[in-house]
């Protein structure tokens, strides 16, 4: 006769492991007992359990409540056992020793491999600001057995670097994603992808990028200088900028206070019917937590009675 088993049995942490051992004997042969032992190198054999044809299943105190026979129907030549709720410490070599009548003893070994699926974590890097050089956007760490694979899925251009730390029964892998921050990256997803044989599908953790920036400010509304004449209604100046975080706007007049009747509505400065006293230098001040910008314009309200128009100067400063 001969023993049938597996070279390797692979199980995920917490699952039940079936340790197979089947005696394929000649007719008339009987299995008297099947002894299971753990036989890791450098240590003596430690009995796990013994299946006795007359007295049933015996379990080592160290494995009390964790070793069972497979459910019926059972073949008397089948010495397989179930190891319940596999833990990492169960990983190792096991031996099945079958005592038969009248053929004698047979033995076979198998390796139990316990997969420990990773629980990945993603940690964002420092605040990203436009103008910085190569900066850490995020790091992703996953620990498991065997070592997991950690990669990145994103449309954003960047560089990755990985390092691995081996522990006694597992390995931790950390991957970092570096980029040169630009405003076009705002709102873009950066996804850490963790692969592992103990996972049915890849685990994904997504981080949304936030890059602080503030665009140059400019003022619109003076494109047609001829519209800025005495008596005109609905005249307005609009300050244009964008930023992250969204900026706030403030209007001032460089050569004095804002004239009465002029309304400030966020990025817009609204004028009452124009008079010559509305002429002056107006400044739009744009700011967010990252930076601030100024843009100033000169408003010259024309008197239709005068023949010659006056020029309008637009100056932008930061």
């Amino acid at each position: 006769g001969e023993l049938e088993t597996s070279d390797v049995v692979t199980v995920v942490l917490g699952q039940d492991a079936k340790l197979p051992c089947f005696y394929r004997g000649d007719s008339g042969e009987q299995v008297g007992q099947v002894a299971w032992a753990r036989v890791d190198a450098g240590e003596g054999a430690q009995e796990l359990a013994l299946l006795h044809s007359k007295y049933g299943l015996h379990v080592s105190p160290a494995y009390e409540g964790r070793v069972e026979q497979p459910p019926p129907p059972r073949n008397p030549l089948d010495g397989s056992v179930l190891l319940r709720n596999a833990v990492q410490a169960d990983e190792g070599e096991y031996e099945c020793r079958v005592s038969t009548f009248p053929a004698g003893s047979f033995q076979a070994r198998l390796r139990l491999r316990v997969l420990v699926p990773p629980l990945p974590s993603l940690n964002p890097g420092p605040a990203l600001e436009e103008g910085q050089g190569l900066t850490l956007a995020a790091s992703c760490t996953a620990e498991g057995s065997p070592a997991p694979s950690v990669t990145w899925d994103t449309e954003v251009k960047g560089t990755t670097s990985s390092r691995s730390f081996k522990h006694s029964r597992s390995a931790a892998v950390t991957s970092e994603f570096h980029l040169v921050p630009s405003r076009s990256m705002n709102g873009q997803p950066l996804t850490c992808v963790v692969s592992h044989p103990g996972l049915l599908q890849d685990q994904r953790i997504t981080h949304i990028l936030h890059v602080s920036f503030l665009a140059e400010a400019s003022v619109r509304g003076l494109e047609d200088q001829n519209l800025w004449h005495i008596g005109r209604e609905g005249a307005m100046l609009k300050c244009l900028s964008e930023g992250q975080p969204p900026p706030s706007y403030n209007w001032t007049r460089l050569d004095g206070p804002l004239p009465s009747g002029v309304r400030v509505d966020g990025d817009t400065l609204g004028f009452p019917p124009l008079t010559t006293e509305h002429s002056g230098i107006y400044v739009c001040h744009v700011s967010n937590e990252f930076s601030s910008r100024d843009s100033q314009v000169t408003v010259d309200v024309l008197d239709p009675q005068e023949d010659s128009g006056k020029q309008v100067d637009l100056v932008s400063a930061s």
Partner: nanobody
Framework: EVQLVESGGGLVQPGGSLRLSCAAS????????MGWHRQAPGKQRELVAT???????NYADSVKGRFTISRDNGKNTVYLQMNSLRAEDTAAYYC?????????????WGQGTQVTVSS
């Protein structure tokens, strides 16, 4: 042949403890199983506990958590530590040595030792 000698029986009050011993001699095999059965008056003999050479154990449900079986392979001796004894544990306790024989197993029995639990 195998010879078995039990000792340690006696009279004990409910809740008390006793330790039985059984020494085996003769042709003991390397794959033998040792254990204890008991037989109360007018009842059939029932398995109490058995232990393998490697220390794996099997207990009757009625004694789990109260009785502990152990063995010393060097001395070919098996022990039964009995705690929290009850009146229903009163019986003759028999040591058994299970040896391979031909096409199966042969049980060798001791003469028994009496355990009486009574107040």
């Amino acid at each position: 042949e195998v010879q078995l000698v039990e000792s340690g029986g006696g009279l004990v009050q409910p809740g008390g403890s006793l330790r039985l011993s059984c020494a085996a001699s003769g042709s003991i095999s390397s794959i033998n199983l040792m254990g204890w059965h008991r037989q109360a008056p007018g009842k059939q003999r029932e398995l109490v506990a058995t232990i393998t050479r490697g220390g794996s154990t099997n207990y009757a449900d009625s004694v789990k958590g109260r009785f502990t079986i152990s063995r010393d392979n060097g001395k070919n001796t098996v022990y039964l530590q009995m705690n929290s004894l009850r009146a229903e544990d009163t019986a003759a306790y028999y040591c058994v040595d299970v040896e391979p024989s031909g096409m199966g197993w042969r049980d060798y029995w001791g003469q028994g030792t009496q355990v009486t639990v009574s107040s």
